[in-house]
């Protein structure tokens, strides 16, 4: 009896949309007993791996993966995955990440809410091989 | 693929150097557990390296023996001051679910 | 310290029979990583149960995995001859280490 794992969720705090120079952070929930959370950019050839993995119910477990100043070039979309031992789940929708220069004006907030559920999401591709989610051989690049 | 080498006869007090090679699987995806088992014993956990490269260790092997990816293909298990106890086959496996033939360690003078 | 113990050193059964091995955990097993392996002499351990009661690919229904929290159970039902092998249990915990069970033997009549 082959136990499913559920699919991950990812959300950024404070949102999708940062200014230039902010911090984002990008949180990825699981279920309870996960080992690794993966967050992987555009790709799975860019991805950066985490073992503090806190219990954020009696039922979930998340990790926070944190760019501290964003540039330009953090912008694209992101996803999760997490090894439970021995496997790895599928892949969260994607998120979008949006960075815009910093424009101070009063009608615009700075950031927007973002999570696996909201409009920058796209369907995750269903390629994925739960033995291989990162390409075969390929060096971790850290994504920032 | 999972296969140990680096087995052999070590006199009392010495270090030794395993190697886990592996095949058709990437290492960044993957725990390698390190495992061994003494003539005619049951199953003792040393420790493991996970996909980030982290390594959790029995608390009987802290401090003497170290797990390392030593490249993109191959895991080392490094042991030091070793004694006869330490005399036993030396497993690595995939997590749990491909493991190697073993490696026989022997410490005698 | 994480002791695993597996009362039965030997439990013994017709063909045809079941077996039942049992496995208790000095602590609590993190979110039900409880294994059981098989193994035979001059072989490695193979794994037939995960998460305590998920089966690995190509063993067969005749192997169940059973329990919750410091006490689990491995059933051999329908028992054959090539069942006669040591049966260990693993425990994985909080804080990512790991524990075997002494083992237990089992002899098919």
């Known amino acids: 009896q082959e136990e499913d794992l559920p699919r991950p969720s990812i959300s950024a705090e404070p949102g999708t949309v940062i200014p230039l120079g902010s911090h984002v952070t990008f949180v990825c929930r699981g279920p309870v007993g996960v080992q690794t959370f993966r967050l992987e950019r555009d790709s799975r050839s860019t991805y950066n791996d985490t073992e503090d993995v806190s219990q954020a119910s009696p039922s979930e477990s998340e990790a926070r993966f944190r760019i501290d100043s964003v540039r330009e070039g953090n912008a694209g979309l992101y996803r999760c995955i997490y090894y439970k031992p021995p496997k790895w789940s599928e892949q969260s929708d994607y998120l979008e990440l949006l960075v815009k220069e910093s424009s101070g004006g009063p009608d615009s907030p700075d950031t927007e809410p973002g999570s696996s559920a909201g409009p920058t999401q796209r369907p995750s591709d269903n390629s994925h091989n739960e033995h291989a989610p990162a390409s075969q051989g390929l060096k971790a690049e850290h994504l920032y | 693929s999972v296969k140990e080498s680096g087995g052999r006869l070590v006199t009392p007090g010495g270090s030794l150097t395993l190697t886990c090679t592996v095949s058709?699987?990437?290492?960044?995806?993957?725990?390698i557990q390190w495992v061994r088992q003494a003539p005619g014993k049951g199953l003792e956990w040393i420790g493991f390296i996970s996909p980030a490269g982290n390594g959790y260790y029995a608390s009987w092997a802290k401090g003497r023996f170290t797990i390392s990816k030593a490249s993109s293909t191959t895991v080392e298990l490094k042991m030091t001051s070793l004694t006869a106890s330490d005399t036993a086959t030396y497993f690595c496996?995939?997590?749990?679910?491909?493991w190697g033939p073993g490696t026989l360690v022997t410490i005698s003078s | 310290e994480l002791v695993l113990t597996q009362t039965a050193s030997s439990v013994s059964a017709a063909v045809g029979g079941t077996v039942t091995i049992s496995c208790q955990s000095s602590?609590?097993?993190?979110?039900?990583?409880l294994s059981w392996f098989q193994q035979k002499p001059g072989q490695p351990p193979k794994e037939l149960v995960y998460w305590t009661s998920t089966l690995q690919s190509g063993v067969p229904s005749r192997f169940s995995g059973s329990g919750s929290g410091t006490q689990f159970t491995l059933t051999i039902s329908d028992l054959e001859c090539d069942d006669a092998a040591t049966y260990y249990c693993?425990?994985?915990?909080?804080?990512?280490?790991?524990?075997f069970g002494g083992g237990t033997e089992v002899v098919v009549k």
């Open positions: 496996a995939r997590h749990w679910d491909l």
């Open positions: 058709g699987f990437s290492l960044s995806n993957y725990n």
């Open positions: 693993l425990g994985g915990y909080s804080g990512w280490f790991y524990a």
């Open positions: 602590q609590s097993v993190y979110s039900n990583y």
